[in-house]
């Protein structure tokens, strides 16, 4: 995995990307920025789209690209899955065109792993927006992961993505 210095994670300092379910990142990000300040300036240009509300996943998706998730156990940043990208693009590209802009090439969905698996880790996000959430009432963190079976202690509930993440070090895909 390389030396300790190389894979150290940094706190996310971008306000719009805080409280999204993970709080550390590692630069450079998935579009090449070395500094969080530069990533933040680019992110601010998406504010009209976020405020428009074309996709409830948009902010999480953008943050997963501009400040991808970092874990001390893995020496690569964990960004969005292609499925989340496609879902966001399907909903937001028409709105972007109304603003007079094209879908950014830097967010080309083919750049991202189609789904999370053993070979390519990625964040799948909160799930398909057309499907209502299974829980009508808020669930406390830690309660969900009993559904994965007898090895539930190997998983941790991630609030923002609404699913169970396999803890680092266990031999399986990142998401259940």
């Amino acid at each position: 995995f390389g030396d300790e210095e190389e894979r150290r994670c940094d706190p996310i300092r971008i306000s719009m990307c805080q409280n999204l379910g993970y709080n550390v990142t590692k630069m450079p990000n998935l579009v090449g920025h070395e500094l969080q300040t530069d990533a933040e300036l680019q992110l601010t240009t998406f504010t009209p789209l976020i405020q428009y509300g074309c996709s409830s996943q948009l902010q999480f998706f953008l943050c997963s690209v501009y400040v991808p998730m970092c874990t001390e156990k893995i020496n690569i940043p964990i960004g969005p899955c292609g499925g989340m990208c496609l879902s966001v693009k399907r909903r937001c590209e028409p709105v972007l065109k109304e603003f007079g802009f094209a879908w950014p090439e830097s967010l080309n969905c083919s750049k991202f792993p189609p789904q999370n698996d053993h070979n390519h880790m990625c964040m799948e996000g909160p799930g398909d927006e057309e499907v209502p959430l299974p829980h009508k009432t808020p669930i406390q963190p830690g309660e969900e992961c009993h559904s994965v079976g007898t090895n539930s202690d190997q998983y941790i509930w991630v609030k923002r993505s609404l699913n169970c993440v396999l803890k680092c070090g266990y031999d399986a895909g990142l998401y259940s």
Partner: antibody
Framework: EVQLVESGGGLVKPGGSLRLSCAAS????????MSWVRQAPGKGLEWVSA????????YYADSVKGRFTISRDDSKNTLYLQMNSLKTEDTAVYYC?????????????WGQGTLVTVSS | DIQMTQSPSSLSASVGDRVTITCRAS??????LNWYQQKPGKAPKLLIY???SLQSGVPSRFSGSGSGTDFTLTISSLQPEDFATYYC?????????FGGGTKVEIK
């Protein structure tokens, strides 16, 4: 129609201060980052400063850092540039510009500019 | 800081000519490159963003290409209203920087 109107320029002595204003209309001001770009007489464009839509993040060119302060008043839809310790090389037309681009920072609307002259 | 170098600094051309302006970044900036047109006494106008995307309302005779460090603005058939100064601008990192400009004059 998007409109940006700068004001506050004028003649000031070296070491003096000036505050530029930019009144914005025709768009949801709080949704957009804003910027100041200047152009010295007969010269090219120089980016000066930018501020996020929330006002929580500010950015400066090295040449003005510590002397200029960008701010915004969303209740008035107005952008400001407070310029202190002015130098003769700050003489320029100052443009207010809306920053957008959805992943690349572009200036899609500009004001007409206000001239700042720093001279003794 | 990323330096942006435009060439040529000025050129003379005739109506109908194909005109090419180049912009070189001192380090790779991916596709974070925009082009503006400025006429005397006026504010700049956005032409191309993200290296090759035409801004809404800009005539299709304008096109942009390139990625990394080398970029090109092309005017396929120069029109009388195109005589102006053109600037490139990088938005890859702060401080944002502009090229020195290319003045397109009537031959």
């Amino acid at each position: 129609e998007v409109q940006l109107v700068e004001s506050g320029g004028g003649l000031v002595k070296p070491g003096g201060s000036l505050r530029l204003s930019c009144a914005a209309s025709g768009f949801t001001f709080t949704n957009y980052a804003m910027s100041w770009v200047r152009q010295a007489p007969g010269k090219g464009l120089e980016w000066v400063s930018a501020i996020s839509g929330s006002g929580g993040s500010t950015y400066y060119a090295d040449s003005v850092k510590g002397r200029f302060t960008i701010s915004r008043d969303d209740s008035k839809n107005t952008l400001y540039l407070q310029m202190n310790s002015l130098k003769t090389e700050d003489t320029a037309v100052y443009y207010c510009a809306r920053a957008t681009g959805f992943g690349t920072v572009v200036f899609d609307y500009w004001g007409q500019g206000t001239l700042v002259t720093v001279s003794s | 800081d990323i330096q942006m170098t435009q060439s040529p600094s000025s050129l003379s051309a005739s109506v109908g000519d194909r005109v090419t302006i180049t912009c070189r970044a001192s380090q790779s900036i991916s596709s974070y490159l925009n082009w503006y047109q400025q006429k005397p006494g006026k504010a700049p106008k956005l032409l191309i963003y993200a290296a090759s995307s035409l801004q809404s309302g800009v005539p299709s005779r304008f096109s942009g290409s390139g990625s990394g460090t080398d970029f090109t603005l092309t005017i396929s058939s120069l029109q009388p209203e195109d005589f102006a100064t053109y600037y490139c601008q990088q938005s890859y990192s702060t401080p944002l920087t502009f090229g020195g400009g290319t003045k397109v004059e009537i031959k």
